[in-house]
């Protein structure tokens, strides 16, 4: 007569994190007397998951009524699965004794846990950069399993190709992380642009996760300056305007100098916004010509977003 066999019909089981995993096990005989125990892993370091004879296993329930007289089904359900539960589970028959001795083990069932990646977090450079410069963006997502994952970068819907991606750790793990760095060349039109990191994983059922970064937080568009003299408003007054165009962000301070001496300083307030997200602003200076014997050099000096000042000058002719 053939002795007791321990049958684990499933070589592998895959479960989504948070769900319950059912691990099947049947025995072909009720003898020898002794409990069934479930372990994760093999060898001396194996972890006890369930013992029919004794112990408290709050996450484990038996699928069949284990006290039922003719029960030979020792399948278990493990609730609230996390990636840390992944591994190979063995159903083991023990023979009654002091202590109980291992009699026969099932072939094992590998439990893999499908865990969703966290929402991708995209971060840009610490300091702003100007158009034509290349900046780096990083994207990170954590806690997913299995390891296979796809990451794509987009700028305004256009896929980027200049990026490097790593999935860690390289070896077997309960869960994984992805880290990607993309290089983006800034243009003057990028104030309204977005960089998107898109992560696709088996757990997301075709609906990828996205993380975004607004280039408005990364770009600095320096202004262009134009100083013009307006027609004389009164016999002894000249209106000089300084047009500050196409700048971003708004933080800007303008100083008027007359022959190198500070005349007035003001901060950009009532700006107008261009379609591309940059700003325009205009400042004017009324110059009292009668107060000057010689020609006057007027300078519009602009300090934008904490950068070194740029200036534009205009020579005002004072006729005798």
């Amino acid at each position: 007569e053939e002795e007791l066999q321990v049958i684990q019909p499933d070589k592998s089981v895959s479960v989504a994190a948070g769900e319950s995993a059912i691990l099947h096990c049947t025995v072909t005989s009720l003898i020898p007397v002794g409990p069934i125990q479930w372990f994760r892993g093999a060898g001396p370091a194996r972890e006890l998951i369930y013992n029919q004879k004794e112990g408290h296993f709050p996450r484990v329930t038996t699928v069949s009524e284990s006290t039922k007289r003719e029960n030979m089904d020792f399948s278990i359900s493990i609730s609230n699965i996390t990636p840390a539960d992944a591994g190979t589970y063995y159903c083991v028959k023990f023979r009654k004794g002091s202590p109980d001795t291992e009699f026969k083990s099932g072939a094992g069932t590998e439990l893999s846990v499908r865990a969703k990646p966290s929402a991708p977090v995209v971060s840009g450079p610490a300091a702003r950069a100007t158009p034509q410069h290349t900046v780096s963006f990083t994207c990170e997502s954590h806690g997913f399993s299995p390891r296979d994952i796809t990451l794509k970068w987009f700028k305004n819907g256009n896929e980027l190709s200049d990026f490097q991606t790593n999935v860690d750790p390289v070896g077997e793990s309960v869960s994984y992380s992805i880290h990607s760095t993309a290089k983006v060349v800034l243009t003057r039109e990028d104030v309204h642009s977005q960089v998107i990191c898109e992560v696709a994983h088996v757990t997301l059922q075709g609906d990828p996760l996205r993380g975004t970064a607004n280039l408005s937080e990364t770009i600095r568009v320096p202004p262009t300056l134009e100083v013009t003299q307006q027609p004389v408003r009164a016999e002894n007054q000249v209106n000089v305007t300084c047009q500050v165009r196409k700048f971003y962000p708004q933080r800007l301070q303008l100083t008027w100098l007359e022959n190198g001496n500070v005349s007035r300083t003001e901060t950009a307030s009532t700006v107008t916004e261009n379609k591309d997200g940059t700003y325009n602003w205009m400042s004017w200076l009324l110059v009292n010509v009668s107060a000057h014997r010689d020609d006057v050099k007027l300078t519009c000096q602009v300090e934008h977003d904490g950068q070194p000042a740029v200036s534009k000058s205009h020579d005002l002719k004072v006729s005798a």
Partner: antibody, heavy 115, light 111 residues
């Protein structure tokens, strides 16, 4: 589902007897069969259990004198070196104890050891 | 070997009475619950009532219940019926698979 015993009778001291326990309505292949005896007017006494794959175990007093075996339909208990104190009704029962209790019993067969 | 001591050895009771029989093991039974109760009527084979200390066997009336753990166990008949007059045995298992011992029995008689 039942167990039917046979093979009891009168035997002389030192003699042998083979008891049979036939199952009907279920297979013995996945169950242990235990033997329990009851001397006249006395209580129950566990003798031994016969399992699958050659697994058998006996009460300390029965070791060496009593030997069990089984097929998928019939269990046997060989009684040897019989003594007067072995006189009893011998029952076979399906089960091996703990979570596999003795739930189906035979009607019993009387073994009388006397000269 | 494990020794099972039943008490009382006999008792007289009336129909409708609550009856309690105890069984004490000389050491903890296997798994703290390797204890079964059997009923035997004269000229008949024993019948399983309770196993794993407290699990009611199939077809057994719910007036029978078992309790206890380790070394001390109880069989309770909540309301004695005429068909319950019989002898009751506990069967305890020690840690060794060849260590199964019946108690000496408790005879429940009509008062």
């Amino acid at each position: 589902r039942q167990l039917v015993e046979s093979g009891g009778g009168l035997v002389q001291p030192g003699g042998s007897l083979r008891l049979s326990c036939a199952a009907s309505g279920f297979s013995l292949s996945s169950h242990g069969i235990s033997w329990v005896r009851q001397a006249p007017g006395k209580g129950l006494e566990w003798v031994g259990t016969i399992g699958t794959g050659g697994i058998t175990y006996y009460a300390s007093w029965a070791k060496g004198r009593f030997t069990g075996s089984k097929t998928s339909s019939t269990a046997y208990m060989e009684l040897s070196s019989l003594r007067a104190e072995d006189t009893a009704v011998y029952y076979c029962a399906r089960g091996s104890a703990w979570n596999d209790p003795f739930d189906i019993w035979g009607q019993g067969t009387l073994v009388t050891v006397s000269s | 070997d494990i020794v099972m001591t039943q008490s009382p050895s006999s008792l007289s009771a009336s129909v409708g009475d609550r009856v309690t029989i105890t069984c004490q093991a000389s050491q903890s039974v296997y798994g703290n619950n390797d204890l079964a109760w059997y009923q035997q009527k004269p000229g008949q084979a024993p019948k399983l009532l309770i196993y794993l200390a407290s699990t009611l066997a199939t077809g057994v009336p719910s007036r029978f219940s078992g309790s206890g753990s380790g070394t001390d166990f109880t069989l309770t008949i909540s309301s004695l019926q005429p068909e319950d007059f019989a002898t009751y045995y506990c069967l305890g298992g020690g840690d060794d698979e060849a260590d199964n011992t019946f108690g000496q029995g408790t005879k429940v008689e009509i008062k």
